[in-house]
């Protein structure tokens, strides 16, 4: 047996992080996002749960809704009606999937200072929102959409087709929620509140995933979810628009699907209102390399929405799939005709384009060997966007302003030089027409949120600077974080290395690779974090590395689309390449290298362990995908095509973890999964375990009863990280 090695950080003034610190969330940070209610006014929920109104220009602030009112119904969230007469209070939050939840809603009348009685809302509600003007309410209850002209009125029932696990109106089914919309809702008000657009998802023919939920009863419950796996029948989707001014005078009007899309299986991908009587729908072929953006207009004389062919814009990828993770959405100009959109340029970098008539005639607005990430706001004279251009670091985000009123348009980086060392990764929140905006910096230093003037970009005030966190970290020995790149052949890989305090290049350290590696993901980001791997570096003296290999985002399509139709190959190869490079650096103990990952990262870590290279002593896979046939159609097929003989079945079969069961013989493998994982089904780990048993390969496993993909209940999470820590320390011969 190798003697145990104990890592002792030197210097006694500061203490190392403990696992308890991480599990208790002792060093979590705060951000401040204003809830904008006008060009210069916003709301914010205070620490003590008062809802406070702020006017930037008059400097006025007052409590609009007291914490006692919130407490009276146990409210955890709120929403002010645009006419400022009512507030909805949300309570009894009950999580469903990643974004979806149900809740009880109460309407509080700010004028009268009392709750609205009469025609109270049913419970639990699946989604509720105010119209953009006035105080109309749209809500979804039992998969049907209802409308109230005012909170105290009886509702109009807009849809009647809703049925549990069959037909969903105004809310997505499982696969659309997780893989397409990334929202809990599928309804959108027109800007003036006249129309309400919504999607109907018909899941009647979708196969059901069923799993046991053990609970406390004598018999387990069975959870049934319509869940299309790769190649299975998909939801049938239709988009309708209802005139909410006269809901019984005109029924919901269906929006036609573009012919080139409707000719085979397709997806709805997003809806954007352009003006009060113009809407933009985005559609995607099931083979997700063709996207169509369709602009439709209301024809009052026909009571119909017309989507002329000359208002269809096609986006196609010849090297992979359309878009990044999702197809980007358009940001329309004031003229309600032209728009700005991010898509790949001729060099394969995602950039902002201006489309006036056809995509072919698009004018490229940004260019370079970097990528535009997101368009925040388009005003009369400015376009605000984020990119990773600055200093050539793909893992940074800065906010830029293009003055589109000028000819030629001029570009300015709003954030690049604000707090250069502390802040390299920003997002922003703009008031309606960008008169003011908040910047939220996520790191690499302590996060800070600030308020700015939209015309001059001047900082007006600091909204949150995490002073308490700064103070509590003063006596903590934090590891050193480096973000660098390594080259191999013609490829460049960015990596983040977390080095133990008092790191000494002349010594040898155990190495843990943390991997995600999914298509269009990014792990190497200039953000602040104090988490499990921070603790491992700080207290246990482990070097941590994260590497963005091929298939990861924001470095051009050549790098991104390298994994198209062959998942599980280059992602793994690039992690192995990086490990070899790290060994060459001289401070890694080759005998003590591990890899771990969750979800897609669990898949990659499993394949890396089974690569037969002998690089890894041990590794952990949490909730891994084990075969792309077991995962959701929209995701799997986006990157792998269909699991059919005439398409890509061969690689679906070749890329499973099970196919490599024999290769786990010489590594220590810890396999972990929640039994109530609605996303990456327990089936994935069950099949890995079965294959390992059949191959007579020893391994360790842990399941978490009734836990989902996040294994996030307090007790389970504590157990999980404690268990993984023990496993790693044992693997690295670190004493407890």
């Amino acid at each position: 047996l190798r003697p145990s090695r104990v890592y002792k950080p030197e210097g006694n003034t500061k203490r190392a992080l403990t696992l308890k610190d991480i599990l208790n969330g002792t060093f979590s940070y705060k951000t401040y996002f204003p809830n904008w209610i006008s060009e210069q006014e916003y709301l914010h929920q205070s620490e003590d749960d008062n809802i406070v109104f702020y006017n930037i220009e008059t400097r006025e602030s007052y409590i609009i809704l007291s914490n006692s009112t919130m407490k009276s119904v146990n409210a955890t969230d709120y929403g002010l009606s645009p006419d400022r007469q009512f507030v909805y209070l949300e309570s009894d939050y009950s999580k469903l999937w990643r974004y979806s939840y149900t809740a009880t809603y109460y309407i509080y009348d700010l004028q009268n200072g009392e709750f609205v009685r009469g025609y109270e809302l049913p419970r639990p509600i699946q989604y509720l929102c105010w119209s953009p003007v006035g105080s109309k309410l749209a809500y979804v209850y039992q998969n049907n959409i209802y409308l109230k002209q005012r909170p105290g009125d009886p509702p109009f029932q807009i849809t009647y087709t809703g049925r549990e696990n069959r037909i969903f109106n105004g809310i997505p089914d499982w696969v659309y929620e997780e893989e397409m919309l990334a929202t809990k809702y599928a309804l959108w008000w027109s800007p003036d509140g006249k129309f309400l657009a919504y999607v109907e998802f018909n899941d009647s023919d979708i196969p059901i995933i069923a799993y046991s939920y053990y609970g406390d009863g004598q018999y387990p419950r069975t959870i049934n979810i319509p869940y299309p796996k790769a190649g299975a029948k998909n939801p049938v989707v239709r988009v309708f628009i209802v005139d909410t001014t006269y809901p019984h005078h005109v029924g919901p009007m269906e929006v036609p699907v573009p012919e080139m899309i409707a000719s085979s299986d397709y997806y709805f991908s997003w809806l954007t209102w352009v003006s009060s009587e113009r809407v933009c729908l985005q559609w995607l072929k099931r083979v997700q390399n063709v996207s169509v953006l369709s602009i439709c207009d209301f024809r009052e004389d026909w009571h119909a929405w017309e989507c002329p062919k000359n208002q269809e814009h096609v986006e196609e990828s010849r090297t992979g799939w359309a878009g990044g993770f999702f197809v980007s959405t358009p940001a329309f100009s004031q003229d309600a005709t032209s728009y700005y959109k991010i898509f790949s340029d001729k060099d394969g970098y995602k950039h902002i384009h201006y489309i006036k008539d056809t995509v072919e005639n698009a004018i490229q607005i940004t260019s370079g060997k970097w990528e535009a990430i997101y368009i925040f706001r388009v005003t009369q004279d400015s376009l605000f966007y984020s990119s990773n251009e600055f200093e050539g670091y793909p893992g940074r985000r800065n906010i830029y302003r293009i003055s589109i009123g000028n000819s030629p348009p001029s570009k300015k980086c709003v954030t690049c030089h604000l707090r250069k060392e502390r802040c390299q990764y920003y997002t922003a929140s703009f008031s309606y027409k960008a008169k003011y905006y908040a910047l939220v910096c996520y790191g690499p230093g302590l996060p800070i949120s600030t308020l700015h003037d939209g015309r001059t970009d001047q900082e007006i005030q600091v909204l949150e600077e995490n002073k308490e966190l700064e103070n509590s970290l003063r006596n903590i020995q934090l590891p050193k974080v480096e973000i660098k790149k390594l080259k191999d052949g013609g490829l460049t890989f960015w990596y983040k290395m977390i080095l133990p305090p008092q790191f000494d290049r002349s010594k040898k350290y155990p190495l843990l690779i943390q991997v995600y590696g999914g298509p269009c993901s990014q792990s190497v980001k200039s953000v602040f974090a104090v988490n499990w791997i921070t603790y491992l570096a700080s207290k246990e003296g482990i070097v941590i590395a994260l590497v963005d290999g091929r298939g990861t985002a924001f470095q051009g399509d050549k790098f991104l689309h390298a994994v198209y139709r062959k998942l599980g190959v280059y992602e793994v190869e690039d992690q192995l390449t990086a490990v070899r490079k790290f060994i060459e650096m001289g401070f890694i103990d080759e005998e003590r290298i591990a890899i771990w990952g969750w979800s897609y990262g669990g898949y990659v870590s499993s394949l890396a362990l089974a690569s037969g290279t002998g690089l890894f002593k041990c590794g952990i896979a949490v909730a891994p995908v084990s075969s792309w046939e077991y995962y959701a159609s929209i995701y799997s097929e986006r990157f792998m095509g269909l699991p059919t003989k005439d398409d890509n079945l061969e690689h679906y079969k070749n890329s499973t973890v099970m196919a490599r069961a024999e290769y786990f013989r010489n590594v220590d493998y810890l396999l972990i999964h929640g039994t109530a994982d609605d996303n990456v089904h327990f089936q994935n780990s069950a099949q890995i375990a079965k294959a390992l048993v059949n191959a007579q390969v020893d391994f360790q496993a842990m399941w978490y009863s009734d836990q989902n993909h996040g294994i996030s209940s307090g007790r389970s999470q504590n157990h999980l990280y404690t268990h993984m820590t023990h496993f790693l320390k044992q693997c690295f011969s670190l004493s407890d």
Epitope: Q157, Y160, P247
Partner: antibody, heavy 125, light 107 residues
């Protein structure tokens, strides 16, 4: 007082067309939808469609697709309903009725509060 | 489309009786229901809107109740002029639909 006055009875042959008028008085004509409803002998009511006099926009029931046309004349505060390709089962009393909800506001249904006296249309060969 | 079903189709009653007519919607319509009275050879007259609101000028012996799918029109004390046919109408969703009618006759 508010009233709707309809044109007189009509006898038509199958395949022909009929136009029924409905003149409004005693209120602001543009502010209220006018609906057309028919009642076959000894039967209940069948809703046919509506016109928004303010905009001239119409909408009708699926059953009358392509056969019914509703128009209005703002100068005389009159709406017209034309039914084409008449069949014997179109024999009925045709009513115009005012919708109490306002065309200019978010919709609340208060009912059809003012009705015309009815126009008997007989379709017979 | 939503169907409206009234019951009974006819009722015989005497002056002073309490008469109840029910109307059932094939799907929920909240409170978007109106009641009409029609006498032979005449146009209908609006009695009740929004399920329970009395139209102005209508005697208070008429009342409406219900929400969702089940609704009731009650005449608390039948008067000679109340002998007529009564119709319900839904206005929750397109197209508006009427019940088939309930005839109140003299016993």
């Amino acid at each position: 007082q508010m009233q709707l006055v309809q044109s007189g009875a009509e006898v038509k042959k199958p395949g022909a067309s009929v136009t029924v008028s409905c003149r409004a008085s005693g209120y602001s004509f543009a502010d209220h939808f006018i609906h057309w409803v028919r009642q076959a002998p000894g039967q209940g009511f069948q809703w046919m469609g509506w016109i928004n006099p303010n905009r001239g926009v119409t909408h009708h029931a699926q059953d009358f697709q392509g056969r019914v046309a509703m128009t209005r004349d703002m100068s005389t505060d009159t709406v017209y309903m034309e039914l084409t390709s008449l069949r014997s089962d179109d024999t009925a009393v045709y009513y115009c009725a005012r919708d109490e909800s306002l065309t200019a506001r978010p919709y609340y249904f208060y009912g059809f509060d003012v009705w015309g006296q009815g126009t008997l249309v007989t379709v017979s060969s | 489309d939503i169907q409206m079903t009234q019951s009974p189709s006819s009722v015989s009653a005497s002056v002073g009786d309490r008469v109840t007519i029910t109307c059932r919607a094939s799907q929920g319509i909240s409170s978007w229901l109106a009641w009409y009275q029609q006498k032979p050879g005449k146009a209908p007259k609006l009695l009740i809107y929004a399920a329970s609101s009395l139209q102005s000028g209508v005697p208070s012996r008429f009342s409406g109740s219900g929400s969702g799918t089940d609704f009731t029109l009650t005449i608390s004390s039948l008067q000679p002029e109340d002998f007529a046919t009564y119709y319900c109408q839904q206005a929750n969703s397109f197209p508006p639909a009427f019940g088939q009618g309930t005839k109140v006759e003299i016993k």
